[in-house]
Amino acid sequence: FERTRSLQDPCSNCPAGTFCDNNRNQICSPCPPNSFSSAGGQRTCDICRQCKGVFRTRKECSSTSNAECDCTPGFHCLGAGCSMCEQDCKQGQELTKKGCKDCCFGTFNDQKRGICRPWTNCSLDGKSVLVNGTKERDVVCGPSPADLSPGASSVTPPAPAREPGHSPQ
């Protein structure tokens, strides 16, 4: 059926960058400026995306492909194809409806985007806190308290080197 249709349908010969023009006996007409067709055989072209305001043009629209946007400095992309730009915050902050707010005690954010996340609870893994957490950094968990008790170390210290000619005391 596909083969039959392509033999009968003159529009199937229209390449990307054109549309099949019903007003001109189905000849292939070039897409108007600021529009594109990324596949062949299209009856219309698509309007190019315009990167305005907080959006910045990453790739210009051509007759065969849409424009691609990213965000101006101080903002980052969200959504498929950068459909939204969201304000950056500093590390140690998260974006709320009232703007950037510092992370609450016990939480951190090490990026300019996203939300504050709770510090790791070292005790859940039977470990102790080696380095305290901050608004910008998670805690660093160390060995468990049991690992630190005298004589319980699993790491055997190296035997002291003996000097030649000295017998052990």
Partner: nanobody, 122 residues
Amino acid sequence: EVQLLESGGGLVQPGGSLRLSCAASGFTISAEDVGWVRQAPGKGLEWVSAILDFGGSTYYAESVKGRFTISRDNAKNTLYLQMSSLRAEDTAVYYCARVVYHAGGGVTFDTRGQGTQVTVSS
């Protein structure tokens, strides 16, 4: 009914100038995206220039940048194309075109006139 009537074509020597006019009726030229397309002998249509978006931003094909100027007279509902430093490769039939935006989001264009022949030859 939308009508577009082109005029101003002719035979001109290389390096010469011409001004094409397109008198529009059935729509307001200042409220539409309009422009010029051309068809050289044995070739397909090519966009030459256009005035886009109500703000009046302009588009020019790379091959005519710096040589052609598009403008419109809203009072006369007329579109113009001032062509200078003409070259043999500018020889074509020039059509006035109106960009059509469809409800489904697609875009095409209309050329209702017969076009005006521009021949650049010595």
